[in-house]
């Protein structure tokens, strides 16, 4: 592989220049097709970018291209104008040429960006030479926004720059006006002004009136050294164009419009925020608007102009507050299509948007936020927060006005005090417990939608990670064993690496939870329990005495236990064990281990069917002597003896 061509590219400032075969020309001894001569950009340009003419010029920087694409003029270098002026800048591209099986060739393409170059698309050699617009018979300041030779100064090393200036020598004066520096006219005897005077805003063009023909001046600009000495350096001879406008030649410029917002059936004035133009050569009364198309949600009216709709009005009507929009009962937004003219220029299209606000909004809270206990956090959804008015409000915004006590609201995993409906719908708003001392929390938000607000309280509860028995009824008067078949927090234990604890908050209404002795030899009867652990459940140390509802005929009943479940590093949770009870039926297989059965049933105890269906021996053989209130092992013996 060999590389020919100058490997230098000269680019005009701010322009796009194609790479050509003069710049970059690869060939191979095998006469390889240019499509197969591949360049890879190892290091891209610093002062601009390389892109392909056929591809999206805003896309990613070019990484690969072929010699064929260079030949076709499709590989372009674009120089990006920096904020600071310069005279000449240099850029480099490091390329690697490859075409297997030949060895790769490294190449450097040097790019020179210079104001020295003759540039058809940028005829001026100055940083700015934009010309000036001036109203007929008036004066206008020529500032560095229009004429600026700072780039000539940029050719001087920065330490010496402050001692230099640029001298503009007027070689042809304006024919229809005059130039003034610090209010002193320039003339053949004093034809100079400086870049520093231009930068200080001291150069003025005064038009002499008598027509709107073009004007301008020619000048030569070159560097001037300390104490006015002439120095070698860049210079240029150019013309500065001055366009003289008729006093009412400038067309009105429409300004950005804010939508009018009002509630259904109401009336609102239209102000300059909705309709305004900039037109220095027209009075507000001369700027006329005409309604081309009106929306269905109301009409425009003029104060003092009758009650009906108006189709023509002026900027003066707007400025004085006489123009109003009258909304009908519709809740849909609408747009007025208007045309606007100052009478001298062609009409310009404009629009006025009208947004009908809800008279009230409602924050719908369909369900409290349930936080899984082992996770300690949960995403909010439309179930928790959704705003409706006369329609759904997908663009509602929320602000926290009373934060949660035991946690934080987060967006993107970061604490926040404001969020949007959109973020809720994406699952991005998360409530996380940070203080594990409560099983519930709440926070208050202010919802804002289309200018109307409403507040709401979101309740947060923790969903216990607990497997609860959900089988058939339990026998009244019996004591059944509470074990992991009834209550099991084993998964919570695994997830937290701790032994979960239970606290009895409420219930049962008929009966009680007791700790049963380990063996017959253990002294004491069963003890009332208010707290226990998962280990207690696994050890079979707990019993539930199922009572009979008092003062009513025997029959099925319902009861429940309310428990608070605690574990390390997670919030506590309240859980309920709901169960049905029925009079004891010795013939019925109960799906829990019974530690004792009702006294009256014990006459049947010797019969085979008195064994519990779980394969546990009946109470005569297995009960660890619970001293239950209504009948126990001793009273069972006593009853049998006397019978």
């Amino acid at each position: 592989l060999s590389l020919k061509g100058s490997q230098t590219l000269t680019v005009c400032p701010g322009s796009v220049q194609p790479l050509s075969s003069q710049t970059l020309r690869a060939s191979s001894s095998a006469g390889t097709d240019p499509q197969l001569l591949l360049y890879r950009v190892v290091r891209g340009p610093q002062l601009g970018r390389l892109f392909h003419a056929q591809q999206d010029s805003t896309g990613e920087a070019l990484v690969n291209f072929t010699q064929a694409e260079v030949y076709a003029g499709n590989i372009l270098y674009e120089h990006e104008m920096p904020p600071e002026p310069f005279w000449e800048a240099h850029d480099t591209l490091e390329l690697q040429l490859s075409s297997p099986p030949a060895r790769d060739v490294a190449a450097t393409l040097a790019v020179a960006v210079s104001f020295e170059a003759a540039c058809p698309q940028h005829p001026s050699h100055l940083w700015k030479n934009k010309g000036l617009w001036v109203p007929e018979g008036q004066r206008a300041r020529i500032t560095v926004a229009a004429l600026d030779a700072s780039n000539l100064l940029a050719s001087v090393p920065s330490p010496q720059r402050s001692e230099h200036d640029v001298l503009f020598q007027v070689t042809q004066f304006p024919s229809r006006g005059q130039l003034l520096v610090s209010e002193e006219p320039l003339h053949a005897g004093q034809p100079h002004f400086l870049q520093s005077q231009l930068a200080a805003g001291q150069l003025v063009y005064a038009h002499g009136g008598g027509g709107t023909q073009q004007d301008g001046f020619h000048f030569r600009a070159h560097l001037q050294g300390p104490a006015g000495a002439s120095v070698a350096g860049p210079q240029t001879s150019e013309a500065f164009a001055i366009t003289v406008r008729d006093v009412n030649e400038r067309p009105p410029q429409p300004q950005a419009s804010v939508p009018l917002r009002l509630t259904r059936g109401s009336r609102a004035p239209i102000s300059r925020a909705q309709l305004s133009v900039v037109d220095p050569d027209s009075a507000p009364g001369e700027i006329e608007y005409e309604v081309q198309r009106a929306p269905h949600n109301g009409f425009l009216s003029l104060v003092g102009g009758g009650l009906g709709p108006v189709t023509r009005f002026t900027q003066a009507d707007v400025d004085s507050g006489r123009l109003a929009f009258v909304a009908n009962g519709s809740s849909v937004a609408g747009i007025f299509q208007l045309s606007m003219s100052d009478g001298a220029s062609p009409p310009l299209p404009m629009s006025l948007a009208v947004d009908i606000l809800p008279s009230a909004i409602e924050v719908q809270l369909r369900a409290p936020l349930e936080v899984p206990q082992a996770l300690g956090r949960s995403s909010l959804s439309q179930q928790q927060l959704r705003v409706v008015s006369d329609r759904e409000e997908p663009e509602a915004a929320y602000r926290l006005i009373q934060g949660p006590q035991y946690g934080h609201l987060l967006v993107g995993g970061r604490p926040t005090s404001a969020f949007s409906q959109f973020q809720i719908d994406q699952g991005e708003v998360v409530f996380a417990f940070t203080n594990f001392s409560s099983s519930h929390d709440h926070f208050r938000v202010l919802a804002l939608a289309r200018g109307v607000n409403a507040s709401a309280v979101v309740n947060v509860t923790v969903r216990a990670l607990l497997h609860v028995w959900a089988g058939g009824p339990w026998p009244q008067g019996a004591t059944l064993r509470l074990d992991p078949t009834v209550l099991d927090a084993g998964e919570l234990a695994n997830r937290t690496g701790s032994v979960p604890r239970f606290r009895l908050l409420e219930g049962p209404r008929h009966g009680r939870v007791v700790r049963v002795p380990r063996a017959r030899t253990e002294p004491g009867g069963s003890q009332l329990v208010e707290q226990f652990t998962q280990q207690d459940l696994e050890d079979g140390r707990l019993g539930l005495e199922v009572g009979r509802p008092e003062g009513r005929a025997p029959g099925p009943a319902g009861d429940s236990l309310t428990l608070e479940l605690w574990a390390q590093g997670v919030p506590p949770a309240v859980a309920s064990l709901d169960f049905a009870t029925e009079p004891y039926n010795a013939a019925r297989p109960y799906s829990v281990a019974l530690l004792s059965v009702p006294e009256a049933a014990r006459t049947e105890a010797g019969k085979p069917e008195s064994s519990t269906p779980t394969g546990e021996p009946g109470p005569m053989a297995s009960s660890p002597e619970p001293a239950v209130a209504k009948g126990g092992f001793l009273s069972f013996l006593e009853a049998n003896m006397f019978s």
Epitope: P372, V411, G412, G413, R414, P415, T416, F422
Partner: antibody, heavy 112, light 107 residues
Amino acid sequence: QVQLQESGPGLVKPSQTLSLTCTVSGGSITDGYYWNWIRQHPGKGLEWIGYITFDGRNNYNPSLKSRVTISRDTSKNQFSLKLSSVTAADTAVYYCADFDYWGQGTLVTVSS
Amino acid sequence: DIQMTQSPSSLSASVGDRVTITCRASRGIREYLNWYQQKPGKAPKLLIYYTGSLHSGVPSRFSGSGSGTDFTLTISSLQPEDFATYYCQQYSELPWTFGQGTKVEIK
């Protein structure tokens, strides 16, 4: 402090599926909020691929959605990225991150 | 998608200089913005989250400000270890998007 470590093949053939795993140590993946995959093409900026959340929800960058799957294995404290039908344009350094902490990145080259 | 545009794309500065990098979002993102630092061959490191909150272990010479669409990262006194590329990232809307980066080089 949480540490993340990417693992997986450094070379994948075009049209095949890129598979990477991120192992989280010093914390549980049910403790973080968003477990992300991000990639960086050579010499370029960062592109978010997608995430899996603490509660197992996914969100993916629409530009890659049809080809991406992010899953997790809580028992191994890992989450994974699968990117199907890869092309040379998928050559990049792939990072796993929870945004507070990032893995050191793994370069995946797609080439035949 | 929300486009994030950083400026400048690169800058040269000296140790001790005050450096400011700006990031502009194509639409409002409230304060949902993070800043990262990345050194060659390394993973990005979180510097600032939620526009102005300093991540743990990050020196106090780094600060962030802004809201809506315009955001700024400031390094009050540039240190030798601060020469790196800096990225902003929004997390207001999915997909989460990054700026194209600002390279801070030694003058």
